[in-house]
């Protein structure tokens, strides 16, 4: 560790005195202290002499000697007071800049330690300190305002009592800066813009921050726009607003607009797209298939996406039949707006009834005309089966009718004994009918098919079963010949009816 001579912590001299401070170390040494007049520095190997033959109050301060080559970074210090009866203060800085909640050192150094008892800190022109200003004093360093606040950004003076009167230092400006959490907050409105050529448009780019030192600009396709800036301060934030007003837009105004703001913490940017169109437009689309199939009793939501400019003047859902003249309940239709020019319209159809199959159309209108999008809704049904015994062209025939949607497939089973439903162990014969005759097949209705099984002789201790199935379910009908006549059995667990 370097050694300073004289080996005292502080030295008090009068103005005009000669002061010699000598520092000796193992290697080369350096002096560090407030740059001030009249000092001369002589270095001689491992010692360095700081001297003046005309000390002034401006030489008051702490002088530290360090050994740059010392890995431990040891240093020695001495504080020099040059006690000038006319100058109780040596102010080392005209301005102090700190962030909020940091301690702010106002470096007015007392030139005479005897005056310490009568010191105080005031604002310029003798105004008292603001309430809740918490400060302390050190004759070597000055006044420290603890946990400085933005509102304490003021001009201060240090005051000392000399011979019963207060003597002020020159003023020190304190700038307490807001702690800037990051780049300025940005808004760019609208988020998207569409205009017809010749219409007016407005784009507003605004940025705000707790600190006034930030820049904001608006650019169009990477070209910075020259727009007058409006500034404001509210809610403890500085706001800067750029408003681009276009009286009659044209195609060259279209494109990407970016609002960019920056401060010491960095840069933020946000963008929007401006479309200029020749005329009004209205586009309807759906992510769903326009042909829908749903099992009876289940629910369905029909969704239509609308892209339009100008906005819609009217819209509605309509049921086009074929079953009834009922119209969808308004409470089942709702609209959600994705953004200014895109909307989603939903029609909810819960617990679908047979009479609700058919065509549903969404109609919308704007100044560009009207458009419609139509969904076709077909209901799926499990098969319903019935069997009768009849003679066709003199031959005994079992006739099976099955109706459902999608079109059912038909299988005949012959099994031993009398039963409501043939099981595997009883089955004697199985016939698949790959091409049953279609009796009816109208849009949105069930498909009815008929299958014929020609039986030369009915075996009386046997059961004939017609089974039908489709993607929804299956149905069956058992036919049991009885000597007194044919007897038919629908299964016990027969069909669910909505």
């Amino acid at each position: 560790i370097p050694v300073i001579e004289p080996s005292v912590p502080e030295l008090v001299v009068k103005p005009g005195a000669t002061v010699t401070l000598r520092c000796v170390g193992n290697g080369s040494v350096e002096w560090d202290g407030p740059p001030s007049p009249h000092w001369t520095l002589y270095s001689d190997g491992s010692s360095s002499i700081l001297s003046t033959n005309n000390a002034t109050f401006q030489n008051t301060g702490t002088y530290r000697c360090t050994e740059p080559g010392d890995p431990l970074g040891g240093s020695a210090a001495i504080h020099l007071y040059v006690k000038d009866p006319a100058r109780p203060w040596n102010v080392l800085a005209q301005e102090v800049v700190v962030f909020e909640d940091q301690d702010a050192l106002l470096p007015c150094l007392l030139t005479d330690p005897v005056l310490e008892a009568g010191v105080s800190l005031v604002r310029v022109r003798g105004r008292p300190l603001m309430r809740h200003t918490n400060y302390s004093f050190s004759p070597w360093h000055g006044f420290t305002i603890h946990r400085a606040k933005f509102i304490q950004s003021q001009d201060y003076q240090c005051s000392a009592l000399m011979g019963g009167r207060k003597v002020m230092s020159i003023s020190i400006r304190l700038k307490v800066q807001k702690v800037i959490p990051g780049p300025p907050a940005l808004t760019l409105v609208p988020a998207e813009l569409v205009r017809i050529r010749g219409e007016a448009a407005q784009i507003v780019c605004s940025a705000s921050s707790v600190d006034v030192n930030f820049d904001v600009f608006l650019q169009h396709n990477n070209t910075k726009l020259a727009i007058p800036q409006q500034s404001d301060f509210h809610n403890n934030r500085y706001q800067k607003v750029l408003t681009l007003n276009l009286d009659q837009v044209d195609f060259q105004h279209a494109g990407n607009y970016s609002c960019v703001a920056s401060n010491v913490q960095g840069k933020h940017s946000t963008s929007m797209f401006f479309r200029v169109v020749e005329s009004a437009y209205l586009n309807l689309s759906s992510e769903q298939n326009l042909i829908q199939e749903v099992t009876v009793g289940e629910g369905l939501n029909l969704k239509v996406m609308v892209e339009a400019y100008p906005g819609l003047q009217g819209f509605n859902w309509t049921y086009l039949g074929p079953f009834s003249d009922h119209q969808p309940e308004p409470k089942l239709a709702n609209a959600t707006t994705k953004d200014t020019y895109r909307h989603t319209f939903t029609l909810s159809l819960p617990r679908l009834k047979p009479s609700e199959a058919g065509r549903y159309s969404f109609l919308a209108r704007n100044p560009g005309g009207w458009r419609a999008l139509t969904f076709e809704l077909t209901l799926r049904y499990p098969p319903e089966v019935s069997v009768i015994w009849t003679f066709i062209n003199g031959s005994g025939t079992l006739l099976c009718a099955a109706s459902g949607y999608p079109q059912p497939n038909v299988t005949w089973l012959q099994c031993s004994g009398h039963t409501d439903r043939c099981d595997e162990a009883q089955v004697l014969q199985v016939w698949d009918d790959p091409y049953p005759e279609v009796l009816s097949q109208e849009p949105f209705h069930k498909v009815t098919v008929q299958s014929l099984l020609t039986v030369e002789t009915l075996e009386h201790n046997q059961t004939y079963e017609c089974r039908a199935h489709n993607s929804v379910g299956s149905g069956s009908w058992a036919f049991i010949p009885i000597s007194a006549g044919a007897h038919t059995h629908p299964p016990d667990e027969f069909l669910f009816t909505p």
Epitope: E30, P34, P35, H38, L41, Y42, L92, A104
Partner: antibody, heavy 116, light 110 residues
Framework: QVQLQESGPGLVKPSETLSLTCTVS????????WSWIRQPPGKGLEWIGY??????TKKPSLKSRVTISVDTSKNQFSLKLSSVTAADTAVYYC???????????WGQGTMVTVSS | QSVLTQPPSASGTPGQRVTISCSGS????????VNWYQQLPGTAPKLLIY???QRPSGVPDRFSGSKSGTSASLAISGLQSEDEADYYC???????????FGGGTKLTVL
């Protein structure tokens, strides 16, 4: 061994604020006094101001436009010069000030042009 | 206009001794010490002399400084081609309460 490095934009528009940062490496910014000095093209040197801890002293003719601040956590000090004109076009240097007002360590300098 | 006055140019041949003057007033050179800086083309200034006549380590003893009253001078003996540079004097100014520089002298080695 202490080294200084200036950084900041090389082009500033008239009436805007010039902002430069000086990064101190190889030593602590908490010791010594740190200065900003500039040199217009083909001209001499001009002291702008110095900072110690968080307090700064500035050349009187520039005082109203200059802010010098320090960030001890980053070992950096910075210069802000507001309302710039073409006359502020210069190479800006940061330097360490000694007790005898000598600038013993200098950054390499950064050229700042004020132009629209 | 610089506070301290220096001749704009000086020249000498290799091996020669050259002196550059710096004139001030009682508020600067008259009451404070003088420092000298060398600025080689395209580089930052370098401290050459401090406290009137002190050389930082690494500066050749061909460079020397002196002060008398309100003037100071820098002498370079045994001039070398690498000495071709701009030289600036500087001193604390009591009225400005800060350092001031001379306008600089361009030294040409012929």
């Amino acid at each position: 061994q202490v080294q200084l490095q200036e950084s900041g934009p090389g082009l500033v528009k008239p009436s805007e604020t010039l902002s430069l940062t000086c990064t101190v490496s190889g030593g602590s910014i908490s010791s010594y006094y740190w200065s900003w000095i500039r040199q217009p093209p083909g001209k001499g040197l001009e002291w702008i101001g110095y900072i110690y801890y968080s307090g700064s002293t500035k050349k009187p003719s520039l005082k109203s436009r200059v802010t010098i601040s320090v960030d001890t956590s980053k070992n950096q000090f910075s210069l802000k010069l507001s309302s710039v004109t073409a006359a502020d076009t210069a190479v800006y240097y940061c330097a360490r000030s000694t007790v005898v007002n000598a600038f013993d360590i200098w950054g390499q300098g950064t050229m700042v042009t004020v132009s629209s | 206009q610089s506070v301290l006055t220096q001749p704009p140019s000086a020249s000498g041949t290799p091996g020669q001794r050259v002196t550059i003057s710096c004139s001030g007033s009682s508020s600067n050179i008259g009451s404070n010490t003088v420092n000298w800086y060398q600025q080689l083309p395209g580089t930052a200034p370098k401290l050459l002399i401090y406290s009137n006549n002190q050389r930082p380590s690494g500066v050749p003893d061909r460079f020397s400084g002196s002060k008398s009253g309100t003037s100071a001078s820098l002498a370079i003996s045994g001039l070398q081609s690498e000495d071709e540079a701009d030289y600036y004097c500087a001193a604390w100014d009591d009225s400005l309460n800060g350092p001031v520089f001379g306008g600089g002298t361009k030294l040409t080695v012929l």
